[in-house]
């Protein structure tokens, strides 16, 4: 799940702190949601498996002018600081379904919580 660039070498799993902080931020977004998140902007749904962090970043980055998710975008960048190679982008961008940002965040949060419970910090 850790994204690999053209010059990347795989290492140990990410520390639980980074995942926990990301989960906390997503919880904060969902709980503080008054109006439609990001004015109901739509984003591409992603495959919550390999390359998930990079794919989530690539999807959410297309929401402009929404301060509520900028911290999330930056936190995802910690898992995926350098672009994955061109060949890997094809698997990240299976662009067939769009969903609201709020739903995207909820789906991502549920999946990350599951990973955290199972100790899969990568």
């Amino acid at each position: 799940l850790t994204c690999l660039g053209g010059f990347a070498s795989p290492g140990p799993v990410p520390p639980s702190t980074a995942l926990r902080e990301l989960i906390e931020e997503l919880v904060n977004i969902t709980q503080n949601q008054k109006a439609p998140l990001c004015n109901g902007s739509m984003v591409w749904s992603i495959n919550l498996t390999a390359g998930m962090y990079c794919a989530a970043l690539e999807s959410l980055i297309n929401v402009s002018g929404c301060s509520a998710i900028e911290k999330t975008q930056r936190m995802l960048s910690g898992f995926c600081p350098h672009k994955v190679s061109a060949g890997q982008f094809s698997s990240l961008h299976v662009r067939d379904t769009k969903i609201e940002v709020a739903q995207f965040v909820k789906d991502l949060l549920l999946h990350l919580k599951k990973l955290f419970r199972e100790g899969q910090f990568n």
Partner: antibody, heavy 118, light 111 residues
Framework: EVQLVESGGGLVQPGGSLRLSCAAS????????MSWVRQAPGKGLEWVAS???????YYPDSVKGRFTISRDNAKNSLYLQMNSLRAEDTAVYYC????????????WGRGTLVTVSS | DIQMTQSPSSLSASVGDRVTITCRAS??????????VHWYQQKPGKAPKLLIY???NLESGVPSRFSGSGSGTDFTLTISSLQPEDFATYYC?????????FGGGTKVEIK
Amino acid sequence: EVQLVESGGGLVQPGGSLRLSCAASGFTFSSYAMSWVRQAPGKGLEWVASISTGDTTYYPDSVKGRFTISRDNAKNSLYLQMNSLRAEDTAVYYCARNEGYYFGLTQWGRGTLVTVSS
Amino acid sequence: DIQMTQSPSSLSASVGDRVTITCRASQSVDHFGWSLVHWYQQKPGKAPKLLIYRASNLESGVPSRFSGSGSGTDFTLTISSLQPEDFATYYCQQSNEDPWTFGGGTKVEIK
């Protein structure tokens, strides 16, 4: 306040080794990717290495196989192990918080000077 | 590797002047509609400071007199009204492709 403080620089002979350290404070270190960037005397900036929150590492060809970036989240510290040093590695080495390809290098330390000379 | 070429390499300007620095990439640094170019300021003996990310986004805390524009291969950093604290060297950087590369810098000096 975000602070990054580099140490470990100094004079080393060609072929020698050196380990740089960067002490981070004022932010949750483990939640950020980090990088090293260097600047030869009177020259421009050159990216040297990056490490993700998951310890995935990235290097340019110029240092790959000679330099190793690592982190110790318990100590809020970033490291750069430099082996087989060459004269062209002489530079000020900066530690930087890396917020990714979409956001850039958002915080920098003051740097530590590495001189490779016989 | 992507080469980033800045021009001019140095310029002299007065306080209040409008200053424009250009950066040209050897190939497109656009990625799904985003331009992956960032601008930094460095003063002598100091660490670089991020000014603009993704070509045109002002980093938090950076004065609004700084602005960035461009896409593809051609980018511009503009200082609308030069202030005494703006005399420094400015660098562009691309993050579209590894290795990340910087421009050679543009030194802004007092006229």
